[in-house]
């Protein structure tokens, strides 16, 4: 049988002569030479090698155990005359023993991570791994140790796990955002003689909402005319915030001062500045200077952070208003006059009153728009604004006239205003009252007294402030021995009558009957107006069958001031 | 005076690429985000995407409709804007406008005359 | 995503008509985010209301903007021959978004 234990073997041999790996041998071999021991299999004739007769083998190459950490091979002994097997073939290994001969390597060369800024100690950073290739069953030769050659004291590796945390209270990242950790691994357990590896950690302190706004000034001062619209930009104020991104947005707002309702502030979505604004239109004359007391706050804190104080600082800002020249303004919107018809050229009407708002209160001059006023009929006193009439009125023929009048600086003739003047012309008695319209009518042959023949109507251009009046009558020179008579309804109104029974045609085929209307205003206006009445021949319904061709032409009356 | 112009407009394939330029002159370019609206013929108006300025990043937002497709690029130094557009679609057919907004960085007050895309095989 | 709508989306309006247009967003919006635009055909949109109330410069002032939160409202008290056009609401919080429009006509 064959006499031979496992072989073992160092790996990494240095030795000058092959390595001696150990003996094969039958105890059927009496050293006689009669045998012959032969090897194959793993790395036979290559890297081992036999001594055919003695059955010592030998490595003749220089092993590494990380490479390959078992050889397999078979032996065989076999009678050198006959050829045949002493000893069945048999399988035998070589294990290669472990030297410390590789040093730990990281998974990576660099890391990087990130932690955010005052974190508390012992916060997790980021993990690194070493693997070393020397057999971990055997020894400490693969037994990694972790520490930290560089990053102290602001960090910390757990030596078995190479887990990196923080081993700093407060770390700012406006202080100092970047480390550059070096990490070892050693193996050996970390022992002398032990083999080390070193890997870069890239650390990143992320940003924390830890800092307030801050304003730069505790004052600032703008300047904007009065005429600025509201929404118009006058200023830009920054505060600074040492965080970024999220924790640096600020928020702006006006908390106080006189100026709260006439101001308002933005923030610059982009920049962050504040932007001071016009809300309401303003005014020089009514205020020269509003004070705002403006904060600027983080929209978004961590309230963890609320010990270091309020996230928000105030600053005051005066804005001065400057003076734009403005035209004239009217005491009125509008002015509303009036005016009796029957007044005489330069009667006074009335009055504009308009004034400079400036400070400076630059004396106006007043004119009439002639535009508004083409036949001149108005005029206007340049200086103190008073408006009479350079033409006679007729109400009849207007009675409303709009003009504009115009103010203007005396300085500045570039600065004027307009202002509607609606001028209403007040009625006075000056028209007569006459017909409605021209009357012909006819009386039939058989018509019996008192008959209604024609009711008459009148109108007057007048506008009496009581209503028309009219009275109607027969003109004295017509009224005795009249065929007809008038009669006043008292209602603006009058009938003619018949006074007789009958008429003739053939005797008198038209009659004229002048009648005086008049109204009941002062001074009483009248007129004379005809009344043409012809006789005809009517059927037994009094529908008129025929009448005499021709009238009498006689005049119809003129009007009279009674 | 504010003047936003835009130029590379023109006819593309389904599945092409173009890219549109918008320069700008009459105001601080470097302190205004940057807007590329668009409008398809006879519709209303849809927002393209916006790029912000260098303090923030140029970071770059995006409609849903052309996300991963257009790409805007600002160069501050040339005072100009800029949208790539790639895989072009039928849909993406509009005239496309460059957009300033106002001061403080709201609304959309300064708009360019448009330049058309038209997207047809 | 903050929807807009406006209402109505068409309307038929003389000259001296007082109209009001109206926005409504999906969720409550700061009044300095919400802005107005007029659009003529062919023309690119021009800024008409910013910050909800403040009037663009140049713009009449027949024109108003109001509200807060989730309603607001744009205003021409006598409308003029050259105010006929489509008018749009638009909210800043990205993504923006628009309004579908209000197209309004001469009657």
């Known amino acids: 049988s064959w006499m031979w234990n496992q072989f073992f073997l160092l790996e990494e041999y240095t030795g000058s002569d092959y390595q001696y790996v150990g003996k094969l041998h039958s105890d059927q071999d009496r050293g006689d030479g009669s045998l012959k021991y032969i090897l194959s299999g793993d790395g036979a004739g290559d890297l081992f090698i036999i001594n055919e007769n003695t059955g010592d083998i030998q490595a003749t190459k220089r092993l590494d155990r990380e490479e390959k950490p078992v050889y397999i091979l078979r032996a065989q002994a076999i009678n050198r005359r006959t050829g045949r097997p002493v000893e069945p073939e048999s399988e035998f290994i070589i294990k290669i023993h472990d030297i410390n001969d590789n040093e730990p390597i990281f998974t990576k060369e660099v890391y990087t991570a990130t932690v955010p800024e005052m974190s508390d100690v012992g916060t997790f950073v980021v993990q690194v791994t070493a693997t070393d290739a020397d057999d971990p069953t055997y020894g400490n030769s693969a037994k990694v140790v972790y520490s930290i050659l560089q990053g102290q004291p602001y960090f910390s590796v757990e030596s078995e796990t190479g887990i990196i945390k923080t081993a700093l209270l407060n770390m700012d990242r406006e202080n100092r955002e970047q480390y550059q950790v070096v990490i070892q691994a050693k193996d050996m357990g970390g022992q002398m003689g032990g083999l080390s590896g070193t890997t870069t950690v890239n650390i990143t302190l992320t940003d924390v909402n830890d800092n307030p706004p801050r304003f730069p000034q505790s004052t600032y001062q703008f300047k904007t005319p009065e005429s600025s619209p509201p929404g118009t930009p006058i200023g830009r104020i920054k505060a600074s915030d040492a965080d970024v991104g999220e924790n640096a947005e600020i928020e702006y707002s006006i908390t106080d001062g006189e100026g709260l309702d006439m101001f308002d502030v933005i923030t610059d979505q982009e920049t962050q500045e504040g932007i001071i604004t016009v809300k309401k239109l303003l005014d020089f004359e009514k205020k020269k200077v509003y004070t705002l007391k403006v904060e600027a706050s983080n929209p978004y804190v961590e309230p963890r952070f609320l010990y270091l104080g309020p996230f928000k600082d105030s600053a005051t800002v005066r804005i001065v208003v400057e003076d734009v020249d403005e035209p004239p303004v009217f005491s009125k919107l509008a002015y509303i006059l009036q005016i009796r018809e029957d007044a005489q050229i330069n009667t006074t009407i009335g009055s504009v009153t308009a004034q400079d708002p400036d400070a400076a209160r630059n004396p106006v001059k007043y004119s009439v728009d002639r535009h508004t006023d083409m036949d001149r009929i108005f005029n206007i006193d340049s200086g103190n604004g008073s408006i009479f009439t350079s033409k006679l009125l007729d109400r009849e023929t207007l009675l409303w006239h709009n003009i504009t009048v115009i103010a203007t600086e005396i300085n500045n003739p570039k600065q004027s205003s307009r202002v509607p003047l609606y001028i209403k012309v007040l009625d006075v008695n000056d028209n007569a009252p006459e017909f409605a319209e021209f009357y012909e009518t006819f009386v039939c042959e058989k018509a019996k007294a008192d008959q209604l023949i024609q009711t008459l109507h009148a109108v007057d251009k007048d506008d009496p402030y009581s209503g028309h009046q009219f009275s109607f009558s027969l003109a004295p020179e017509a009224a005795s021995g009249s065929n007809f008579t008038i009669q006043d309804n008292k209602d603006n109104t009058a009938g003619i009558l018949t006074r007789k029974n009958g008429y003739n045609r053939h005797e008198m085929s038209t009659y004229l009957l002048p009648v005086v209307i008049s109204d009941n205003d002062y001074p009483v206006q009248s007129s004379t107006g005809t009344v043409t009445v012809r006789v005809c021949a009517c059927d037994h319904h009094g529908n008129m069958q025929s009448c005499h061709a021709e009238a009498l032409i006689h005049p119809t009356g003129l009007s009279t001031g009674a | 005076e504010v003047q936003l112009v835009e130029s590379g407009g023109g006819l593309v394939q389904p599945g092409g690429s173009l890219r549109l330029s918008c320069a700008a002159s009459g105001f601080t370019f470097t302190t205004y985000a940057m807007n590329w609206v668009r409008q398809a013929p006879g519709k209303g108006l849809e927002w393209v995407g916006r790029?912000?300025?260098?303090?923030?990043?140029?970071?770059?937002y995006y409609a849903d409709s052309v996300t991963d497709r257009f790409t805007i690029s600002r160069d501050d130094s040339k005072n100009s804007l800029y949208l790539q557009m790639n895989s072009l679609k039928t849909e993406d057919t509009a005239v496309y406008y460059c957009v300033r907004p106002d001061y403080g960085n709201y609304g959309l007050a300064y708009w360019g005359q448009g330049t058309l895309v038209t997207v047809s095989s | 995503d903050i929807q807009l709508t406006q209402s109505p989306s068409s309307l038929s309006a003389s000259v001296g008509d007082r109209v009001t247009i109206t926005c409504s967003a999906s969720?409550?919006?700061?009044?300095?985010?919400l802005h107005w635009y007029q659009q003529k055909p062919g023309k690119s949109p021009k800024l008409l209301i910013y910050r909800s109330f403040y009037l663009a410069s140049g713009v009449p002032s027949r024109f108003s903007g109001s509200g807060s939160g989730t309603d607001f409202t744009l205003t021409i008290s006598s409308l003029q021959p050259e105010d006929f056009a489509t008018y749009y609401c638009?909210?800043?919080?990205?993504?923006?978004?628009f309004g579908q429009g209000t197209k309004l006509e001469i009657k």
């Open positions: 790029i912000r300025i260098k303090n923030n990043n140029y970071a770059t």
């Open positions: 969720s409550s919006i700061s009044s300095h985010y």
């Open positions: 638009q909210q800043d919080i990205v993504p923006l978004t």
